[in-house]
Amino acid sequence: MSANATLKPLCPILEQMSRLQSHSNTSIRYIDHAAVLLHGLASLLGLVENGVILFVVGCRMRQTVVTTWVLHLALSDLLASASLPFFTYFLAVGHSWELGTTFCKLHSSIFFLNMFASGFLLSAISLDRCLQVVRPVWAQNHRTVAAAHKVCLVLWALAVLNTVPYFVFRDTISRLDGRIMCYYNVLLLNPGPDRDATCNSRQVALAVSKFLLAFLVPLAIIASSHAAVSLRLQHRGRRRPGRFVRLVAAVVAAFALCWGPYHVFSLLEARAHANPGLRPLVWRGLPFVTSLAFFNSVANPVLYVLTCPDMLRKLRRSLRTVLESVLVDDSELGGAGSSRRRRTSSTARSASPLALCSRPEEPRGPARLLGWLLGSCAASPQTGPLNRALSSTSS
């Protein structure tokens, strides 16, 4: 290389990361094997769980505003879960990104897209729940499935928009030990006249903006909506059912516990540009908290099912139907099996355009999902405890 050839400019923290070398010590190898196993299992669980949630909520339940939120949340989690196998592969080949720069950008973008989408959707659900209580008449007239889908599309668009910088500034960087990193390189595009200033300002801007937009603001919206609902129901002399408290605690706690540490380390990493002493802490902690954030997508479907007996019931029924249709013998085609099928498909057409994944069910409404964010679990939106409370107090 000639003396004048300018090397690929890297921020100090990134260049120092590229200098870190791998050790083949036994205890580290065991940790790596355990990590691969854990992430592999999480990948499988996440894909299956979120796939099942999408199937059950999208095809086995009457479509409501609530099921719309859940569908989009599950879709976001499914996307994240779909990217986990590639992260598992990265771990399996010794923490080296062997899948190229384009896929590095795409893979990382999915992580951030899920981060923003989850935060935005949780905010929307809590605001929706708040509107139902605070503005019941308006909600009655304007809360439609179509409107919810439109809101979700807007939120997805916003999430994509917020993900663009992470796509642009993601890069593959060769480490001195031969491994390849898939990481931020904020000097990748238009580094400006001063690299130090650019590194500092861009790293801080990315860390602070994602902390605010994907974490702090959604949590503030959830908290203030929860407070507004509590105040309104207390004012009406209605004590909110205990399960709402339990459910909101579960979902919001999962979001906060999974994403909180990631944002803390992300902010520490931005601070580490000016304070190199923080770098070792960041290098050690960031992989763990990133995995924890990924696992939120695996945890969510479990929360949906655990907090919703109706969901569990529909899930069991759906799985039984799927197994019956798969395990049915060819000789049974003229018998009971086919009549059961015929009956299902004929009625499904009237119930849903998705005849293949629909089944005639009494209109029970969505799962009691995401705690206080939703009005009811087993009953339809019109007859849920919240709606009953509203009708009795507003009439």
């Epitope: 003396a3 300018t6 200098r19 001063d194 130090d196 070792p280």
Partner: antibody, heavy 118, light 107 residues
Framework: EVQLVESGGGLVQPGGSLRLSCAAS????????MSWVRQAPGKGLEWVAR????????DYPGTVEGRFTISRDNSKNTLYLQMNSLRAEDTAVYYC???????????WGQGTLVTVSS | DIQMTQSPSSLSASVGDRVTITCRAS??????LAWYQQKPGKAPKLLIY???QLADGVPSRFSGSGSGTDYTLTISSLQPEDFATYYC?????????FGQGTKVEIK
């Protein structure tokens, strides 16, 4: 060919001031971080100051902080070291050095001698 | 400040000898170490960066190793032009300090 040529050294009294210059050629000066390193006669090397490629960030060791100021003029491809309140222990050969990336001095000038004596 | 301790401070060796110089940091410097060679009346010359990486134009008989706080410069077969003073320098946290130097002399 990369070249770094220091100038401005000489004899100065304690408490006096001096400004060193380093003329750079053979590379895109504005793309590189630069430093000053000194070496007292018969002694080891000591890093004195560092400046980012655009000049917005500077760093100094405690021994010179507040007395020395590093600056650069990218339009003139020149690095400077303004030395104030000079002491006898500042007597040394002062080298300007180019950073390979963020660190590691890959090219050095031939040095300029600064003598602080009454 | 991080202290860099070089050993030995001087050594005598013959052409063809294998020479090892060590540098110990007072705390972990995470591979952020460079080795320089300086001949009398000349400016230092970069030999090794990032603890193990050979700088451009440096003969392959020079090599660097180590991690954490302990680093080594090895000259596999000493040549006449290698008689000089060698310095290590860390680039972890400012101030970036140098070792006191190791003078390699002809036996």
């Amino acid at each position: 060919e990369v070249q770094l040529v220091e100038s401005g050294g000489g004899l100065v009294q304690p408490g006096g001031s001096l400004r060193l210059s380093c003329a750079a050629s053979g590379f895109t000066f504005s793309s590189y971080l630069m430093s000053w390193v000194r070496q007292a006669p018969g002694k080891g090397l000591e890093w004195v100051a560092r400046i980012s490629n655009g000049g917005s960030t500077t760093d100094y060791p405690g021994t010179v902080e507040g007395r020395f100021t590093i600056s650069r003029d990218n339009s003139k491809n020149t690095l400077y070291l303004q030395m104030n309140s000079l002491r006898a222990e500042d007597t040394a050969v002062y080298y300007c050095a180019r950073h390979r990336t963020n660190w590691d001095f890959d090219y050095w000038g031939q040095g300029t001698l600064v003598t602080v004596s009454s | 400040d991080i202290q860099m301790t070089q050993s030995p401070s001087s050594l005598s060796a013959s052409v063809g000898d294998r020479v090892t110089i060590t540098c110990r940091a007072s705390e972990n410097i995470y591979y952020n170490l460079a080795w320089y060679q300086q001949k009398p009346g000349k400016a230092p010359k970069l030999l090794i960066y990032a603890a193990t990486q050979l700088a451009d134009g440096v003969p392959s008989r020079f090599s660097g190793s180590g991690s954490g706080t302990d680093y080594t410069l090895t000259i596999s077969s000493l040549q006449p032009e290698d008689f000089a003073t060698y310095y290590c320098q860390h680039f972890w946290i400012t101030p970036w300090t140098f070792g006191q130097g190791t003078k390699v002399e002809i036996k």
